[in-house]
């Protein structure tokens, strides 16, 4: 089976790599405009420099193409705590990441929110807090995991996941309160 | 105590639109960055749409970018999101949320409302 191509990927197959069929003449192959640069003008006929501009600011491509228009630079978003870790230029978009002591968690392709690492208080770090995931933190005895924070099993309530944690706590509080002296 | 209180959802044909509101109280809603998230039947949440106290510069899905606009009028503590163009795949229980704040999980988002897009 032959993979179904778009009419754009069509036409660049055409033409060696770093070149595209011209879109008035199938027969002309011009030479892809640079990284920080779009086309402004195909070229005129074979062999013949094609019309690149540099990408204005706010603007960047970040590879080699034919596009009529560079790709708005990316915002860092504030609201979800998002930092600029390298700004914008006409070949590379804005880098945007989270503070010292946080990471991201992704809520979808393109978009992250940055959290507080736990610090994993009545219990300890099994794994390090990472760029792309919290802390794992291992609980002490009495304690048991709820949000990524090790809380009191006195805090567990019959209905909750946590009984099956806390039942040796309780289970040896019990014990303790039957073997009563005779 | 914080609370949230979808409307608007109904049954509406391929092409059609609807607005929804979510009514908000218990906290200062001019303060908050609010969420519109999705629920299909059978899947997991999808994040829709948010928009931060200002109103400025709100975000959107790919799956609903042209398509839904996000809104909110913070003198009625009211969040808006009107959908046109609807598909079938916009079918779902919409819930408005506040934006997470202590990790990746919603403290506080309201029932939902259901949107069923069919002809």
């Known amino acids: 089976l032959v993979p179904h191509l778009g009419d754009r990927e069509k036409r660049d197959s055409v033409c060696p790599q770093g070149k595209y069929i011209h879109p008035q003449n199938n027969s002309i192959c011009c030479t892809k405009c640079h990284k920080g640069t779009y086309l402004y003008n195909d070229c005129p006929g074979p062999g013949q420099d094609t019309d690149c501009r540099e990408c204005e600011s706010g603007s960047f491509t970040a590879s080699e193409n034919h596009l009529r228009h560079c790709l708005s630079c990316s915002k860092c978003r504030k609201e979800m705590g998002q930092v600029e870790i390298s700004s914008c230029t006409v070949d590379r978009d804005t880098v945007c990441g989270c503070r010292k002591n946080q990471y991201r968690h992704y809520w979808s392709e393109n978009l992250f929110q940055c959290f507080n690492c736990s610090l994993c208080l009545n219990g300890t770090v099994h794994l390090s807090c990472q760029e792309k995931q919290n802390t794992v933190c291992t609980c002490h005895a009495g304690f048991f995991l709820r949000e990524n924070e090790c809380v009191s099993c006195s805090n567990c309530k019959k209905s909750l996941e946590c009984t099956k944690l806390c039942l040796p706590q309780i289970e040896n509080v019990k014990g303790t309160e039957d073997s009563g002296t005779t | 105590e914080v609370q949230l209180l979808e409307s608007g959802g109904g049954l509406v044909q391929p092409g059609g639109s609807l607005r929804l509101s979510c009514a908000a109280s218990g906290f200062t809603f001019a303060h908050e960055t609010m969420v519109w998230v999705r629920q299909a039947p059978g899947k997991g949440l999808e994040w829709v749409s948010h928009?931060?106290?200002?109103?400025?510069?709100?975000f959107y899905a790919d799956s609903v970018k042209g398509r839904f606009t996000i809104s909110r009028d913070n003198s009625k503590n009211t969040l808006y999101l009107q959908m046109n163009s609807l598909r079938a795949e916009d079918t779902a229980v919409y819930h408005c949320?506040?934006?997470?704040?202590?990790?990746?999980?919603?403290?506080?988002w309201g029932q939902g409302t259901l949107v069923t897009v069919s002809s």
């Open positions: 928009i931060p106290p200002d109103g400025q510069d709100p």
């Open positions: 949320a506040l934006l997470p704040k202590r990790g990746p999980w919603f403290d506080y």
